[in-house]
């Protein structure tokens, strides 16, 4: 798959690929992975990840399914790279608080939090 | 502070407090701290309270100044608290099948991807 | 158009077995699971267990685990659920029916088939 | 297991009157609930999917909401082909399990 592939594109066709392979890939009734009880995805990227190798070497690879996980290990290469770049930039104090109250605003607006 | 109080009125409180003491907070000029360079916030909450201490040990500390601290280090509790939340649960690969596409669907269409 | 046939009613003495059958249209067969489910005369809903038609790897209610089996024929998209050692209890009408995907709900059902347990 | 317990157990509303079903989980589910509909002679009907999503080709006077525990289906007014039994249903552990019922009948 080239990597030139806009990642949104990506995004799509890997949520298509994944219904269509759904009862493939639960074929193994046993096994069991951790699944986070919380919406807060962003907060569980390593999990979810760790999960999809977990699942990918239990199901037997070939067609579309091995385009599945080539297109997850692609999601996860740009979220790798999204992470890196939390930490690249020194800039001013007032920019810092610029990017904490947009952070506080989206948890106070978008995030799902339980009491 | 008592940590009864609900996350979602904290983070509001907390949003409040950092307007008001802005300009104490900045008044260390030469100060630099790591920010993120995109928008998709939970992905870079290490780097955040990484800063936030960095801004805390600048800071002269005493009345409400105090108390946005105290707040921002429950938020970090929270957020710590539902990291540890991601992993807790082992379920069927039907279950995180659906945690992956609820996952996938927002990145679809709630994140910011660049090109 | 999604449909799920199921075959007719049974009348069927008790310890014996029975097989119905659920034959799946509109749709490719072996990217849903098929559940089943029963109804006794006047009662709630009773989930028996699901089969996965991809792999034909079942997942059964404990309750009944013992005397149910659950089957498919990918060649005619059909399903199929037998129940043995049969009791007048079991006296209910048998739904199968298609397991939506994400979060499993079942969005299509089959018309069910009356089984009869009765001496 | 996990039981469900839906209250309450019959209904009694006239067409046009808002409808509030509840259904209480021993244990919580987070939002692995599903609500059926069903009428006499016929098979349960889908109506919402995980706690709160419209199935497809229902109308949206039907919207259903909780997580946890607690879980509500709301008719925001009454059709006359809404009289009928409707089932709460959770898969969040095996066996998979419904409530028992409420029957929602012409006042």
């Known amino acids: 798959i080239p990597t030139e592939i806009p990642t949104s594109a990506l995004v799509k066709e890997t949520l298509a690929l994944l219904s269509t392979h759904r009862t493939l890939l639960i074929a193994n009734e046993t096994l069991r992975i951790p699944v986070p009880v919380h919406k807060n995805h962003q907060l569980c990227t390593e999990e979810i990840f760790q999960g999809i190798g977990t699942l990918e070497s239990q199901t037997v690879q070939g067609g579309t399914v091995e385009r599945l996980f080539k297109n997850l290990s692609l999601i996860k290469k740009y979220i790798d790279g999204q992470k890196k770049k939390c930490g690249e930039e020194r800039r001013r104090v007032n920019q810092f608080l610029d990017y904490l109250q947009e952070f506080l605003g989206v948890m106070n607006t978008e995030w799902i939090i339980e009491s | 502070i008592p940590t009864e109080i609900p996350t979602s009125a904290l983070v509001k409180e907390t949003l409040a407090l950092l307007s008001t003491h802005r300009t104490l907070l900045i008044a260390n000029e030469t100060l630099r701290i790591p920010v993120p360079v995109h928008k998709n916030h939970q992905l870079c909450t290490e780097e955040i309270f990484q800063g936030i201490g960095t801004l805390e040990s600048q800071t002269v500390q005493g009345g409400t100044v105090e108390r946005l601290f105290k707040n921002l280090s429950l938020i970090k509790k929270y957020i710590d608290g539902q990291k540890k939340k991601c992993g807790e649960e082992r379920r069927r690969v039907n279950q995180f099948l659906d945690y992956l596409q609820e996952f996938l669907g927002v990145m679809n269409t709630e994140w910011i991807i660049e090109s | 158009e999604v449909q799920l046939v199921q075959s007719g009613a049974e009348v069927k003495k008790p310890g014996a077995s029975v097989k119905v059958s659920c034959k799946a249209s509109g749709y490719t067969f072996t990217e849903y699971l098929i559940h089943w489910v029963r109804q006794a005369p006047g009662q709630g809903l009773e989930w028996m267990g699901y089969i996965n038609p991809y792999s034909g790897g079942t997942v059964y209610n404990e309750k009944f685990k013992s005397r149910v089996t659950m089957t498919r024929d990918t060649s005619i998209s059909t399903a199929y659920m037998e129940l043995s050692r049969l009791r007048s209890d079991d006296t209910a009408v048998y739904y199968c029916?298609?397991?939506?995907?994400?979060?499993?709900?079942?969005?299509?059902w089959g018309q069910g088939t009356m089984v009869t347990v009765s001496s | 297991e996990i039981v469900l317990t839906q209250s309450p157990a019959t209904l009694s509303l006239s067409p046009g009157e808002r409808a509030t079903l509840s259904c209480r989980a021993s244990?919580?589910?987070?939002?692995?609930m599903h609500w059926y509909q069903q009428k006499p002679g016929q098979a349960p009907r889908l109506l919402i999917y995980?706690?709160?999503n419209l199935a497809s080709g229902i109308p949206a006077r039907f919207s259903g909401s909780g997580s946890g525990t607690d879980f509500t289906l709301t008719i925001s007014s009454l059709e006359p082909e809404d009289f009928a039994v409707y089932y709460c249903?959770?898969?969040?552990?095996?066996?998979?399990?419904f409530g028992g019922g409420t029957k929602v009948e012409i006042k």
């Open positions: 995980k706690a709160s």
């Open positions: 029916a298609r397991d939506g995907g994400y979060s499993d709900p079942l969005d299509y």
């Open positions: 249903q959770q898969n969040w552990n095996d066996p998979w399990t």
């Open positions: 244990e919580g589910l987070t939002s692995y």
